[in-house]
Amino acid sequence: SPVPPSTALKELIEELVNITQNQKAPLCNGSMVWSINLTAGVYCAALESLINVSGCSAIEKTQRMLNGFCPHKVSAGQFSSLRVRDTKIEVAQFVKDLLVHLKKLFREGQFN
């Protein structure tokens, strides 16, 4: 049976928590990604940013999970207007910011 949206979001949060807690060396070798606007369309925007990081096993599960939340096909090099213009941050900081935002969505009951 399909996973309820609340469970899917909780699983994504859990994965991001695991990444932040288990981080020893710089996440994804310190790769930089485009910062995104967290106020709308967060799942697709996050995927559009993270999909450009390749060869980083630590975030592969996150990429797959975000893909399940995003209704359209996302490919590397694709960017929507949700990108914060010309601002790049480390993947580790991106994950932390995303986690804070998703936890707030969960607490508010915004699962979709």
């Epitope: 609340s6 469970t7 909780k10 949060i13 859990e14 928590v17 807690q21 936890k103 707030k104 969960f106 607490r107 508010e108 009951g109």
Partner: antibody, heavy 123, light 107 residues
Framework: QVTLKESGPGILQPSQTLSLTCSFS??????????VDWIRQPSGKGLEWLAH???????RYNPALKSRLTISKDTSSSQVFLMLASVDTADTATYYC???????????????WGQGTSVTVSS | DIQMTQTASSLSASLGDRVTISCRAS??????LNWYQRKPDGTVKLLIF???KLHSGVPSRFSGSGSGTDYSLTIRNLEQEDIATYFC?????????FGGGTKLEIK
């Protein structure tokens, strides 16, 4: 040391509004990941979760009682308030407040509880 | 809502015994299961959170286990101070729901 203490009217009449106060110490509701819940237990029955308020004022209610419940907080005075409108004899219970911390995973585990305050609804 | 069922409303055991209290959820709660102890004076304490994590200050004779829908609380070497009612609570989905409680008594 974390402590919570509930206070209320003790007795009130049907159709009135129940106002409860939870006064706490040992933590701050301005701290990220902190929350306070209200739970009640009617005599001889199980525990029932009523409402929750997070540090950033996100509020959640039990859907069965949502239309009658209002939760709020005064961070500076370390208090959380619960109002239950249009009370009936079925609302007679011991009312507890408790702290929730959500560091990392969202646990919804209430790690410290008040002693409870007894509320009787009677005409 | 998720229903939480504690089949035993009361249990009788002797001091020094090993006691297991069970709790069943009406659906998978993914280990978001907490155990509370309510003493006869009304004091409520968290014992175990997230199925098996011991809350600070709780004696190590308390332990929790389970997964999916079935969970249990075990008390080893039962002591007089353990006489209380024990409640399970699911923290996976709102509204939060509790089991009906299991009252532990001394034989």
């Amino acid at each position: 040391q974390v402590t919570l203490k509930e206070s209320g009217p003790g007795i009130l009449q049907p159709s009135q509004t129940l106002s409860l106060t939870c006064s706490f110490s040992g933590f701050s509701l301005s701290t990220s990941d902190m929350g306070v819940d209200w739970i009640r237990q009617p005599s001889g029955k199980g525990l029932e979760w009523l409402a929750h308020i997070w540090w950033d004022d996100v509020k959640r209610y039990n859907p069965a009682l949502k239309s009658r419940l209002t939760i709020s907080k005064d961070t500076s005075s370390s208090q959380v308030f619960l109002m239950l409108a249009s009370v009936d004899t079925a609302d007679t219970a011991t009312y507890y407040c408790a702290r929730t911390v959500s560091s990392g995973y969202i646990y919804y585990a209430m790690d410290y509880w008040g002693q409870g305050t007894s509320v009787t609804v009677s005409s | 809502d998720i229903q939480m069922t504690q089949t035993a409303s009361s249990l009788s055991a002797s001091l020094g015994d090993r006691v297991t209290i069970s709790c069943r959820a009406s659906q998978d709660i993914r280990n978001y299961l907490n155990w509370y102890q309510r003493k006869p004076d009304g004091t409520v304490k968290l014992l175990i959170f997230y199925t098996s994590k011991l809350h600070s200050g709780v004696p190590s004779r308390f332990s929790g286990s389970g997964s999916g829908t079935d969970y249990s609380l075990t008390i080893r070497n039962l002591e007089q101070e353990d006489i209380a009612t024990y409640f399970c609570q699911q923290g996976n989905t709102l509204p939060l729901t509790f089991g009906g409680g299991t009252k532990l008594e001394i034989k």
